[in-house]
Amino acid sequence: FGDEEERRCDPIRISMCQNLGYNVTKMPNLVGHELQTDAELQLTTFTPLIQYGCSSQLQFFLCSVYVPMCTEKINIPIGPCGGMCLSVKRRCEPVLKEFGFAWPESLNCSKFPPQNDHNHMCMEGPGDEEVPLPHKTPIQPGEE
């Protein structure tokens, strides 16, 4: 194919997005970053939320947005499914609000395909445990 060079996938160099079930990506990502270094910088701002443990899917979800999966078979990046986004949002948005912030517009779940199919490929992600959120009294986001 003439665009073979254009479609070549790149190894994921962001440490927090390695060993998540896929290991190659293609930039730009789903929020417009051209470089993995820029994506990594943005990802680090979510670390307090990941450490808080609001959703076991959060890290996979964020990585699927900032370093979406790439495959040589198709020339579009494969990001998260809307269902995973909604699950993460439902569990993590209340915690984000405790920090004083709103859910990012860049992670608006309506941007992602509702489910994985041949027309709209997306990643469902690992199953999210339906257990209560970590109990902290009172909630002190960022406190370890």
Partner: antibody, heavy 118, light 108 residues
Framework: EVQLVESGGGLVQPGGSLRLSCAAS????????IHWVRQAPGKGLEWVAS????????YYADSVKGRFTISADTSKNTAYLQMNSLRAEDTAVYYC???????????WGQGTLVTVSS | DIQMTQSPSSLSASVGDRVTITCRAS??????VAWYQQKPGKAPKLLIY???SLYSGVPSRFSGSRSGTDFTLTISSLQPEDFATYYC??????????FGQGTKVEIK
């Protein structure tokens, strides 16, 4: 409660050195960006340096590059600003601040005054 | 380097007035712009993040908006406690946090 407390400011001669500390409580600095921002008397805010302690990434304004060093000790939950080759124009109140989501600096310390004068 | 040109540098207004402060970025900074309020002898306080999102606990009379590379802070009805200096700040480049020059809002 989240708190940032700066210390280490004072009077120093041009060419001298000073080390500022920013002690954090109520959160773990490992997972946040910590910044130093300064404000010269009667002037506006100027970003100086930033660190992401869990990775050690550091960033500097051109005006201090090569003279100032930002660091952090996660075991003490404290960030530092080592200032060398100080100049009169470095005279300012130095604030430390944290940021996470959206890069917004949501908590600030009360500031510490650094005066560079002979 | 990205410059943030803030205007006006100062303004006089009365309680109840609508006040608008503008910051123009020298190049695209996405929406990663924050606004801060600072009173004499005090540390800055976060008002607006991501150009238009109101930080928790900030009164709803404060709002932010974006049009291209122009960012605006609006105080819909100025209150006595709002007399202060306001700064915009960009962080599109995570490693370069540029502040505007500041706008001092004084009592007319």
């Amino acid at each position: 409660e989240v708190q940032l407390v700066e210390s280490g400011g004072g009077l120093v001669q041009p060419g001298g050195s000073l080390r500022l500390s920013c002690a954090a409580s109520g959160f773990n600095i490992s997972y946040y960006y910590i910044h130093w921002v300064r404000q010269a008397p009667g002037k506006g805010l100027e970003w100086v340096a930033s660190i992401y302690p869990s990775s050690g990434y550091t960033y500097y304004a051109d005006s201090v590059k090569g003279r100032f060093t930002i660091s952090a000790d996660t075991s003490k939950n404290t960030a530092y600003l080592q200032m060398n080759s100080l100049r009169a124009e470095d005279t300012a109140v130095y604030y430390c601040a944290r940021s996470s989501f959206y890069w917004a600096m949501d908590y600030w310390g009360q500031g510490t005054l650094v005066t560079v004068s002979s | 380097d990205i410059q943030m040109t803030q205007s006006p540098s100062s303004l006089s207004a009365s309680v109840g007035d609508r006040v608008t402060i503008t910051c123009r970025a020298s190049q695209s900074v996405s929406s990663a712009v924050a606004w801060y309020q600072q009173k004499p002898g005090k540390a800055p306080k976060l008002l607006i993040y991501s150009a238009s999102s109101l930080y928790s606990g900030v009164p709803s009379r404060f709002s932010g908006s974006r049009s291209g590379t122009d960012f605006t802070l609006t105080i819909s009805s100025l209150q006595p406690e709002d007399f202060a200096t306001y700064y915009c700040q960009q962080s599109y480049a995570a490693y370069l946090f540029t502040f505007g020059q500041g706008t001092k809002v004084e009592i007319k």
